[in-house]
C-alpha cells in the first residue's frame, strides 16, 4: 500500500478513504512533494499581510506587508511598522534618532555616526538624523603645501550638524 502512495505526485494526496487513490488537493491547500497523505492548508495573507503569490496545488502562498509596514523573519512571518528616515521603532512607536546617531531607512535602528578621526580623517559633511557623516582627507593631507582642491570643512566630531 505504501508503494501506491509514493506514486501520488505533488499537488495530490494519498486518499486512505478511497483505497489509496491520489486525490487532488482541495482548494486552498497544497502538497509540495509527492507521496503525501494530506495536503497542507494554504497560508492566508490577511490584515497587515497582502498576497505576493497565490497558493497553487504544489506551493504555498507567499505574503508581503501592506504599505507602511515591512517584512520580518523567514518568509515574511511578521510585519513591522515602517518609521521615517531619521527614526527608529521603539515599544512606544517611532522615535527620532538621538543626537550622534542616524537611520537612512524606514526600518531598523539608529546607528552611530562614523567617527572619522578613528581613521585619521576629518569630517567633510556633517551627519544628520537621516545621514551618516562623510569623512574627507586627513588633516595632515590638508596642511599648507599639500595640494587640495577644496578647503577643509571645520572638523566637528563626531559629525554634529546644528539642529
Amino acid at each position: 500500500l505504501q508503494d501506491l502512495c509514493s506514486n501520488c505526485p505533488a499537488g495530490t494526496f494519498c486518499d486512505n478513504n478511497r483505497s489509496q487513490i491520489c486525490s487532488p488537493c482541495p482548494p486552498n491547500s497544497f502538497s509540495s512533494a509527492g507521496g503525501q497523505r494530506t495536503c497542507d492548508i494554504c497560508r492566508q495573507c490577511k490584515g497587515v499581510f497582502k498576497t505576493r503569490k497565490e497558493c497553487s496545488s504544489t506551493s504555498n502562498a507567499e505574503c508581503d506587508c501592506i504599505s507602511g509596514y515591512h517584512c520580518l523573519g523567514a518568509e515574511c512571518s511578521m510585519c513591522e511598522q515602517d518609521c521615517k528616515q531619521g527614526q527608529e521603532l521603539t515599544k512606544k512607536g517611532c522615535k527620532d534618532c538621538c543626537f550622534g546617531t542616524f537611520n537612512d531607512q524606514k526600518r531598523g535602528i539608529c546607528r552611530p555616526w562614523t567617527n572619522c578621526s578613528l581613521d585619521g580623517k576629518s569630517v567633510l559633511v556633517n551627519g544628520t538624523k537621516e545621514r551618516d557623516v562623510v569623512c574627507g582627507p586627513s588633516p595632515a593631507d590638508l596642511s599648507p603645501g599639500a595640494s587640495s582642491a577644496t578647503p577643509p570643512a571645520p572638523a566637528r566630531e563626531p559629525g554634529h550638524s546644528p539642529q
Partner: antibody, heavy 114, light 111 residues
C-alpha cells in the same frame, strides 16, 4: 460539477458587454477563476484571474478595458468595454489553472461586427 | 508580463513516433507551468501541471520536464488520438510579475 459561460452575442464596435461564468456543484469563491479567450483559428489568450481571496490579476493588454468580478459565490463576471473586431473570440472561464484538477466551461462566442 | 515562446508551431510524425514540444519562459517561473491539449471545437484538457506532474487520467506516454526557463512536453508512442494543438501556460499568480500567458501552440499531425 461544471462551469458554463453566458452572455456572448453579436455586438457592434464600442458596445460594452458582460459575460457571466456560472458554477454548478461547487462554490466558485473557493477557487482561482481565470478568463481565457480564443479568436477563430487562433491560440489561447489569457485575460485575467480572480483569486479565491478576491485578488484580481490581468494580462497587461487587458488591464483597463476588462474587469473581472465575483458577484456571488457561484458566478464570476467579465465586463468588457470599447469592444473592437479584434475582440471577436470564444471566451472561456476556467477553474484553478495552478491546480491538478482544473475545469473549463464550453465557452461563449462574442462577435464584434459593424 | 511573462512571455511564453513555444516551438515548433507544427510538427508531423508517424504513429508510434515521439514528439517533443518546447516552451521558453521570458523569466524564471520556477515550476509554474501547465500543458494543455485542445482538439477543434473542444475546451482545453490538462495534461501536465507544475511542469512535470501528470494530470489524473492522462496516459504516461505524456511527460513534462523543466530545465531552467525551458519546459518540454514529450509525447511518446504517438496515437491517432494525439492529433491536436498543444499549449503551455504559465500558471504563476502573483503581484511581482504577471503570469497566465499561453504559448502560441503546437499543432501535432501525422505523416
Amino acid at each position: 460539477r461544471s462551469l458554463e459561460e453566458s452572455g456572448g452575442r453579436l455586438v457592434t464596435p464600442g458596445t460594452p458587454l458582460t459575460l457571466t461564468c456560472t458554477a454548478s456543484g461547487f462554490t466558485i469563491s473557493s477557487y482561482h477563476m481565470q478568463w481565457v479567450r480564443q479568436a477563430p483559428g487562433k491560440g489561447l489568450e489569457y485575460i485575467g484571474t480572480i483569486s479565491s481571496g478576491g485578488n484580481v490579476y490581468y494580462a497587461s493588454w487587458a488591464r483597463g478595458r476588462f474587469t473581472i468580478s465575483r458577484p456571488s459565490s457561484t458566478t464570476v463576471d467579465l465586463k468588457m468595454t470599447s469592444l473592437t473586431t479584434e475582440d471577436t473570440a470564444t471566451y472561456f472561464c476556467a477553474r484553478d489553472s495552478g491546480y491538478s484538477d482544473p475545469m473549463w466551461g464550453p465557452g461563449t462566442l462574442v462577435t464584434v461586427s459593424s | 508580463d511573462v512571455v511564453m515562446t513555444q516551438t515548433p508551431a507544427s510538427v508531423s510524425e508517424p504513429v508510434g513516433g515521439t514528439v517533443t514540444i518546447k516552451c521558453q519562459a521570458s523569466q524564471n517561473i520556477r515550476t509554474y507551468l501547465s500543458w494543455y491539449q485542445q482538439k477543434p471545437g473542444q475546451r482545453p484538457k490538462l495534461l501536465i501541471y507544475a511542469a512535470a506532474n501528470l494530470a489524473s487520467g492522462v496516459p504516461s506516454r505524456f511527460s513534462g520536464s523543466r530545465s531552467g526557463t525551458e519546459f518540454t512536453l514529450t509525447i511518446s508512442d504517438l496515437e491517432c488520438a494525439d492529433a491536436a494543438t498543444y499549449y503551455c501556460q504559465c500558471t504563476y499568480l502573483g503581484t511581482d510579475y504577471v503570469g497566465g500567458a499561453f504559448g502560441g501552440g503546437t499543432e501535432v499531425e501525422f505523416k
